[in-house]
């Protein structure tokens, strides 16, 4: 069971990143699915290595004081959402904006029907060029 | 099937990074090989988690306007090269140069004879000290 | 065999990061253990994908000239410590400090009783907020 999906620009104002099965994507079988273009949902319980990479372009003057943060989050059936992993990068002083890449990854136990998704502080700063921003998992 | 190879400084002017089986490297068996010191080639079709880490040292004034970009690329038999993953980091203002590290990783389907390699915008900026820059894969 | 542990602030002056089985941690079975809150020790020989993520907050003026470096280190029985992976990030000019995240990961052969741990140049700069700093491995 494995998946690798590709970022998709979205007009939605949500902080949850959108993904698509496009380009050189992976969706090994129907035991993992991309739901609503926003979350990877697994049907089997077990240990999964889950990862995300986010490339963004921001400028210190044009952004809030707070850093750019990418969060890998989990929603299990009948449970509250929770944060699995986070990474933070201070905005660049480069003009008009400076690109930076964040990589997240870790091993987590997922229940049947559990979904994982990626949240960012400012989706408008995310880079969607080939290979820059992606999201995936693999069952151990 | 797994491999982990170590960066090697090169006098070549190519943007493709060079690697060696040295230091604490891994080459599990002959189903994955390091070819010409530049690409990992697999003999078996399947899903692979492929990763690369690149540490570089650059300075904004001494570099081009464009950021430092590391790309994980694929060459399948009878197919064109394609980009699997990219990461970008804006150059540092630190003098003489500021070090930064990039990590790339994802799950991809590889065909028999497929090769993966790493491209960077400026190989002269790559750091080759112990553990700084490496490249590998594992078959799921 | 898999583990994922969560960073723990420590009053110790050591450069070795401290970890805990807390939050959304993983410890698949007793073939991998967290020892002294500082190292993951495996009982079975084999190939492991080992990873660490470190988020830190630093300022160029308040830090040494040298970059922030995170190192993944190995101690095998009857052998001395060695460095598997390193990542470096130059300190930010943001005030009071600028957050940055480092991700390390690679495939390595471990012997029975081998331990892996994470070293940083300045543990006081490490961010221990939910999901920011973690460490883990999985057996292939």
């Amino acid at each position: 069971i494995a998946a690798h999906v590709i970022s998709e620009a979205s007009s939605k104002t949500t902080s949850v990143l959108q993904w698509a099965e496009k380009g050189y994507y992976t969706m090994s079988n129907n035991l993992v699915t991309l739901e609503n273009g926003k979350q990877l949902t697994v049907k089997r319980q077990g240990l999964y290595y889950i990862y995300a990479q986010v490339t963004f372009c921001s400028n210190r003057e044009a952004s809030s004081q707070a850093p750019f943060i990418a969060s890998l989050c989990l929603k299990s059936p009948g449970r509250f959402e929770r944060i699995l992993l986070r990474a933070a990068n201070t905005h660049s002083s480069a003009k008009p904006c400076g690109q930076q890449s964040i990589h997240l990854g870790g091993v987590f136990e997922l229940q049947p029907g559990a979904s994982v998704f990626v949240n960012v502080t400012d989706p408008s700063q995310v880079s969607h060029g080939t290979g820059f921003t992606s999201f995936g998992l693999l069952k151990l | 099937i797994a491999a982990h190879v170590i960066s090697e400084a090169s006098s070549k002017t190519t943007s493709v990074l060079q690697w060696a089986e040295k230091g604490y490297y891994t080459m599990s068996n002959n189903l994955v090989t390091l070819e010409n010191g530049k690409q990992l080639t697999v003999k078996r079709q399947g899903l692979y988690y492929i990763y690369a880490q690149v540490t570089f040292c650059s300075n904004r004034e001494a570099s081009s306007q464009a950021p430092f970009i590391a790309s994980l690329c694929l060459k399948s038999p009878g197919r064109f090269e394609r980009i699997l993953l990219r990461a970008a980091n804006t150059h540092s203002s630190a003098k003489p140069c500021g070090q930064q590290s990039i990590h790339l990783g994802g799950v991809f389907e590889l065909q028999p004879g497929a090769s993966v390699f790493v491209n960077v915008t400026d190989p002269s900026q790559v750091s080759h000290g112990t553990g700084f820059t490496s490249f590998g894969l594992l078959k799921l | 065999i898999a583990a994922h542990v969560i960073s723990e602030a420590s009053s110790k002056t050591t450069s070795v990061l401290q970890w805990a089985e807390k939050g959304y941690y993983t410890m698949s079975n007793n073939l991998v253990t967290l020892e002294n809150g500082k190292q993951l020790t495996v009982k079975r020989q084999g190939l492991y994908y080992i990873y660490a993520q470190v988020t830190f907050c630093s300022n160029r003026e308040a830090s040494s000239q040298a970059p922030f470096i995170a190192s993944l280190c190995l101690k095998s029985p009857g052998r001395f410590e060695r460095i598997l992976l390193r990542a470096a990030n130059t300190h930010s000019s943001a005030k009071p400090c600028g957050q940055q995240s480092i991700h390390l990961g690679g495939v390595f052969e471990l012997q029975p009783g081998a331990s892996v741990f994470v070293n940083v140049t300045d543990p006081s700069q490490v961010s221990h907020g939910t999901g920011f700093t973690s460490f883990g491995l999985l057996k292939l």
Partner: nanobody, 116 residues
């Protein structure tokens, strides 16, 4: 063939200093991490310090931290260990070593005796 030759050991009083050197040959010295280890009389081997190939990162055992400094000169293929504030418990044969995957390469060692 990997060769490592240590020098600089000797008898020194507590609180004194010594600088050990290790001349390396038979491999591309500047591409490898290097290590100092020691063996006290009647005891097992103890890791003392490591240095990365570029010299940028150094690591020390708690017992020597703040007193010993590891360094290297890649142009001279030489590894150093500056030992200050020496104590009786630092008495040992000091070896420089090049880590390998399956086994490690060792020098012959140099004896350091700390005694009044």
């Amino acid at each position: 063939e990997v060769q490592l030759l240590e020098s600089g050991g000797g008898l020194v009083q507590p609180g004194g200093s010594l600088r050990l050197s290790c001349a390396a040959s038979g491999f591309t010295f500047g591409e490898y991490e290097m290590v100092w280890v020691r063996q006290a009389p009647g005891k097992g081997l103890e890791w003392v310090s490591s240095i990365t190939s570029d010299g940028l990162s150094t690591y020390y055992a708690d017992s020597v931290k703040g007193r010993f400094t590891i360094s290297r000169d890649n142009s001279k293929n030489t590894l150093y260990l500056q030992m200050n504030s020496l104590r009786a418990e630092d008495t040992a044969v000091y070896y420089c070593a090049k880590p390998g995957i399956r086994f490690d390469y060792w020098g012959q060692g140099t004896l350091v005796t700390v005694s009044s």
